[in-house]
Interface confidence: medium
């Protein structure tokens, strides 16, 4: 299953809208900065697009449960987040259309729940966070910049296990 | 592996500018802060300002504010220093310098650093 | 800004002497210390972040502690390749300002 043309510009358009949702500016939130420890190696050792597309799946589903939440609602802009939860629908979409055709059944099932099981941990973390910081707007503002990176890595890896196919 | 690779060595009269070059490789460009900071002969490290090419913000320290640019191209990987209105005391070796490693966040640790560029200002 | 001192500005010591170098931020930094070496003619490498993480491939014999103000490099059996210059630097808030260095020289 190749993802169509049109999932990586969405790729885009999501970073693009994540870039406009911002209200104030990361330097003057420095001192709220969080690692999160993104598990960038569940998308680097993936060593095929099927073992990848469940766990960037998992991904954007946890990117769009982070933002669909009330909490967040009054945090963002309403028009930029009904066009970010548009665009991960859409990928979504497509990502689970390859599920669909079997592209997300391999020999490891496994190392593959082990992947998606991190992310979820990482999201724990985030919104444990979240929670911690009470919702302030330097809170989300970290959290903002750390899933434009996340998800910036995330599509970069996936990106260049397709050049290797 | 990760590196950062910088331009040559400059010589440059006083009042004039000079552009540093600084090639990302290895790493997700775009995603991790790049940093410049300058070493004048003999002396200390002195932080001069820095970007997340993602966010499309650069942040410079405020002995520096309107002398200095920072600009990213993300096409070519590569980070820019511009510095303008230069005296005899920029004469130092600037490096750029980036937080990649896996417990690094930004800004939090400098553990990439280019060689360095050799900037002499003289008359 | 922030201002960061260290001391001693320089240090006298012999291989397999235990060192500590410290560093005084002017306000509070929580935990965003880092620690660099530097050697003549070459970049400096980062030893410790975070006041107290080791740097990926960086020898045990380094470690790092403090909080708020107060913070210490501690290099626990000299080598003959630990003679260098030492910097601590806040990556609390910009500008992120370096101590003036330690120069650890031979006895």
């Known amino acids: 299953c190749d993802l169509p043309q049109t999932h990586s510009l969405g790729s885009r358009r999501t970073l693009m809208l994540l870039a406009q949702m911002r209200r104030i500016s990361l330097f003057s939130c420095l001192k709220d900065r969080h690692d999160f420890g993104f598990p960038q190696e569940e998308f680097g050792n993936q060593f095929q697009k099927a073992e990848t597309i469940p766990v960037l799946h998992e991904m954007i589903q946890q990117i769009f449960n982070l933002f669909s939440t009330k909490d967040s609602s009054a945090a963002w802009d309403e028009t930029l987040l009904d066009k970010f939860y548009t665009e991960l629908y859409q990928q979504l979409n497509d990502l689970e259309a390859c599920v669909i055709q079997g592209v997300g059944v391999t020999e490891t099932p496994l190392m593959k729940e082990d992947s998606i099981l991190a992310v979820r941990k990482y999201f724990q973390r985030i919104t444990l966070y979240l929670k911690e910081k009470k919702y302030s707007p330097c809170a989300w503002e970290v959290v903002r910049a750390e899933i434009m990176r996340s998800f910036s890595l995330s599509t970069n890896l996936q990106e260049s296990l397709r050049s290797k196919e | 592996q990760v590196q950062l690779v910088q331009s040559g060595a400059e010589v440059k009269k006083p009042g004039s500018s000079v552009k540093v070059s600084c090639k990302a490789s290895?790493?997700?460009?775009?995603?991790?802060?790049i940093n410049w900071v300058r070493q004048a002969p003999g002396q200390g490290l002195e932080w001069l300002g820095g970007?997340?090419?993602?966010?499309?913000?650069?942040h410079y320290a405020q002995k520096f504010q309107g002398r200095v640019t920072i600009t990213a191209d993300e096409s070519t990987s590569t980070a820019y220093m511009e510095l303008s209105s230069l005296r005899s005391e920029d004469t130092a070796v600037y490096y750029c310098?980036?937080?990649?490693?896996?417990?690094?966040?930004?800004?939090?640790?400098?553990?990439?650093w280019g060689q360095g560029t050799l900037v002499t200002v003289s008359s | 800004d922030i201002q960061m001192t260290q001391s001693p500005s320089s240090l006298s010591a012999s291989v397999g002497d235990r060192v500590t170098i410290t560093c005084r931020a002017s306000?509070?930094?929580?935990?965003?210390l880092n620690w660099y070496q530097q050697k003549p003619g070459k970049a400096p490498k980062l030893l410790i972040y975070?006041?107290?993480s080791l740097q990926s491939g960086v020898p045990s014999r380094f470690s790092g502690s403090g909080s708020g103000t107060d913070f210490t490099l501690t290099i626990s059996s000299l080598l003959p390749e630990d003679f260098a210059t030492y910097y601590c630097?806040?990556?609390?808030?910009?500008?992120?300002?370096f101590g003036q260095g330690t120069k650890l020289e031979i006895k």
């Open positions: 630097q806040q990556s609390y808030l910009p500008p992120y300002s």
């Open positions: 310098v980036s937080s990649v490693g896996a417990g690094a966040y930004y800004y939090q640790g400098l553990d990439v």
């Open positions: 970007t997340v090419p993602l966010f499309g913000i650069s």
């Open positions: 306000q509070s930094i929580s935990s965003y």
């Open positions: 975070a006041a107290s």
């Open positions: 290895g790493y997700t460009f775009t995603s991790y802060d």
